[in-house]
Amino acid sequence: QGGTRSPRCDCAGDFHKKIGLFCCRGCPAGHYLKAPCTEPCGNSTCLVCPQDTFLAWENHHNSECARCQACDEQASQVALENCSAVADTRCGCKPGWFVECQVSQCVSSSPFYCQPCLDCGALHRHTRLLCSRRDTDCGTCLPGFYEHGDGCVSCPTSTLGSCPERCAAVCGWRQMF
């Protein structure tokens, strides 16, 4: 039946979708649909997403690109990756800050704010887990400090000060009277 060189295309497949009259090739990521194809299995007219907009996937029906999100400065967020035609801005926290989710069931798209990480050194404690997705986990007192209440107290520098049992164990002093 007529030596046709035309490609067969399946409207139900992933490659072509019915847009308007015909099954059309979709637009690649980073492009939006300006006009559908004008023949069966043809190429749609696709244009690159304008600045500050993006489309992350191949698409058949998007006639406009999505606006890039702005990181929330009020929540101390910063852009870890700038928006491109194919990917949205990736917001996060600057070094020394961690993500505190604003909802209980936290997922990647959940609203969040950035909190400064605990500085274990300033608390005279060992850093057990570095701060990234959650706050720093501080460990035991640094050498030359002992546990007293909630904090770490420095070992006395002379025998004149008092040195309780925990102090004595860490600092090597006996309580002097």
Epitope: Q1, G2, G3, T4, S6, R8, C11, K18, I19, G20, L21, F22, C23, P36, T38, E39, P40, C41, G42, H61
Partner: antibody, heavy 123, light 111 residues
């Protein structure tokens, strides 16, 4: 039976506007692509516009693009052609037609036509 | 655009004789083994009427004296035995790609 009743033609000055209507009956209007075809006095047929079923994408030849718009109201079983910036060369009988799709080949033929409405563009 | 060229512009045939109208497309109008072209008949003061679709399929209600043939770029409409009511204008049209284009028409007359 399938019927396409046209209205809206008339005399208009160059640069003017006109809206043609086509009322459909006897078939499920929303399931068909629809077209407008024109015929200048004593001349042949020229395709003017098509609107798809479902997603209502519209298509035009370069001769009318940016001047004409095609639209449909599926609730009212009606097809429209809005013609702006009319020129003397737009003078013609305008026909609305139903586009029937044949099989899975994405192939359309105009199987039913309205009786036509005359548009005259003259000063 | 796909240019459709009809020949002849007019054709004089005796009643009861065969009439043959040709249509040539500037490029192939085939898709998936089907010729996306059709023939219309237009009587004076009336809209066109679909006679043949997909090059050779006769539309329902059309007398069987009408037939279509051809593929690729060359197509023919044949009226096997011309009747008085067939003495009108015939147009070919392609639907392979937009813009849809028509031939210039062939006027059939009685010899």
């Amino acid at each position: 039976q399938v019927q396409l009743q046209q209205s809206g033609g008339g005399l208009v000055q160059p640069g003017g506007s006109l809206r043609l209507s086509c009322a459909a009956s006897g078939f499920t209007f929303s399931s068909y692509a629809m077209s407008w075809v024109r015929q200048a006095p004593g001349k042949g047929l020229e395709w003017v516009a098509t609107i798809s079923d479902g997603d209502s994408y519209s298509y035009f030849p370069d001769s009318v693009k940016d001047r004409f718009t095609i639209s449909r109201d599926n609730a009212r079983n009606s097809l429209y052609l809005q013609m702006n910036s009319l020129r003397a060369e737009d003078t013609a009988v305008y026909y609305c037609a139903r586009d029937r799709i044949y099989g899975s080949v994405q192939y359309y033929a105009m199987d039913y036509w309205g009786r036509g409405t005359l548009v005259t563009v003259s000063s | 655009d796909v240019v459709m060229t009809q020949s002849p512009d007019s054709l004089a045939v005796s009643l009861g004789e065969r009439a043959t109208i040709n249509c040539r497309a500037s490029e192939s109008v085939e898709f998936s083994g089907t010729s996306l072209m059709q023939w219309y008949q237009q009587k004076p003061g009336q809209p066109p009427k679909l006679l043949i679709y997909a090059a050779s399929n006769v539309e329902s209600g059309v007398p069987d004296r009408f037939s279509g043939s051809g593929s690729g770029t060359d197509f023919t409409l044949t009226i096997s035995s011309l009747q008085a009511e067939d003495v009108v204008v015939y147009y070919c049209q392609q639907s392979r790609k937009l813009p849809y284009t028509f031939g210039g028409g062939t006027k059939v007359e009685i010899k």
